[in-house]
Interface confidence: low
């Protein structure tokens, strides 16, 4: 018969014949022959392959280096890589999460729009009129100015984006 020019799914063409690919979690040791099947071996303890493959070496699991602020979020298996994330208060510098940086704080005059996660940094927003933030924080939102009226007080000093209003007693002489 004519040697094949293409193979079925989960097969590969070598020496004019179709050999089975190794399943995820295993690596290729030797190609099949006319008389023998493809020979595969399981990946080692700290290694993985996540696809049907003909790789002769498994991939090393990612190392979540604590020196870079990383910790294991999900332990790798023979078929999956380790997933790293950052320690509390830190976030990944990239999608691959190769290192971590401290969460950004929002300066006075800015509040937290979105609190940081293990993979995204703090998102800050300027405090709009009627709101303020007088601290540098990775958690605090902009606070509304105090409503002097609800306390039967009057505004003695106007608020800014960094300071609250100052309330004082009403002038009793006023009609």
């Amino acid at each position: 018969p004519e040697p094949p020019t293409a193979c079925r799914e989960k097969q590969y063409l070598i020496n004019s014949q179709c050999c089975s690919l190794c399943q995820p979690g295993q690596k290729l040791v030797s190609d099949c022959t006319e008389f023998t099947e493809t020979e595969c071996l399981p990946c080692g303890e700290s290694e993985f392959l996540d696809t049907w493959n003909r790789e002769t070496h498994c991939h090393q699991h990612k190392y979540c280096d604590p020196n870079l602020g990383l910790r294991v979020q999900q332990k790798g298996t023979s078929e999956t890589d380790t997933i790293c994330t950052c320690e509390e208060g830190w976030h990944c510098t990239s999608e691959a999460c190769e290192s971590c940086v401290l969460h950004r704080s929002c300066s006075p005059g800015f509040g937290v729009k979105q609190i940081a996660t293990g993979v995204s940094d703090t998102i800050c927003e300027p405090c709009p009129v009627g709101f303020f933030s007088n601290v540098s924080s990775a958690f605090e939102k902009c606070h509304p100015w105090t409503s002097c009226e609800t306390k039967d007080l009057v505004v003695q000093q106007a608020g800014t984006n960094k300071t609250d209003v100052v309330c004082g007693p009403q002038d009793r002489l006023r009609a």
Epitope: H57, K62, E98
Partner: antibody
């Protein structure tokens, strides 16, 4: 032709620091795992550290963990080993070695650079 | 850590001899075993990887076998340039460990 050329070795006092470099040529540096392996005078081989190709993950021998840092600059085709808090037992020839992708055997080696830690 | 133990530590042989060096792992390492040759003052050279795969450019008189915990490096007919120290190394898991070496000397 694959070539690995180490530099940066020398005499350093205990507690001191040294940075080794390994200039690579003749292959696509970024596609390969790179490692440091050392050999104390008259002794056998000891794996020190590896840095993998994908996300640049790293591994260290317990004897150097927290003191040594492996890194790579793919734009310069260069591997580094930053060695801090050096001890007398770190005295050795340090070899830079290449391994395929994420693999953990060493198919090409540099000629080595001698690090001597002594007062 | 996985301990690698080679035997013998040293060996005297003559040109043309068949020589066998063994390497034992302290736990099963499947076929993740590699062999290196090192000559005095030189860097090691990879001979065999994955227990039995011959590295490109290495003479066919070198062969490797074994799986699990017991492995063998065989030189079918010793040549003058084969007198050197041989190391096994496991690549099953970190820390990657080497055997203590086998020094092959001329008888």
């Amino acid at each position: 032709e694959v070539q690995l050329l180490e530099s940066g070795g020398g005499l350093v006092q205990p507690g001191g620091s040294l940075r080794l470099s390994c200039a690579a040529s003749g292959f696509t540096f970024s596609s390969y795992a790179m490692s440091w392996v050392r050999q104390a005078p008259g002794k056998g081989l000891e794996w020190v550290s590896s840095i993998y190709s994908g996300g640049g993950g790293t591994s260290y021998a317990d004897s150097v963990k927290g003191r040594f840092t492996i890194s790579r600059d793919n734009s310069k085709n260069t591997l580094y080993l930053q060695m801090n808090s050096l001890r007398a037992e770190d005295t050795a020839v340090y070899y830079c070695a290449r391994g395929p992708a994420y693999s953990s055997f060493f198919d090409y080696w540099g000629q080595g650079t001698l690090v001597t830690v002594s007062s | 850590d996985i301990q690698m133990t080679q035997s013998p530590s040293s060996l005297s042989a003559s040109v043309g001899d068949r020589v066998t060096i063994t390497c034992r792992a302290s736990q099963s390492i499947s076929s993740y075993l590699n062999w290196y040759q090192q000559k005095p003052g030189k860097a090691p050279k990879l001979l065999i990887y994955a227990a039995s795969s011959l590295q490109s450019g290495v003479p066919s008189r070198f062969s490797g076998s074994g799986s699990g915990t017991d492995f063998t490096l065989t030189i079918s007919s010793l040549q003058p340039e084969d007198f050197a120290t041989y190391y096994c190394q496991q690549s099953y898991s970190t820390p990657y460990t080497f055997g203590q070496g086998t020094k092959l000397e001329i008888k």
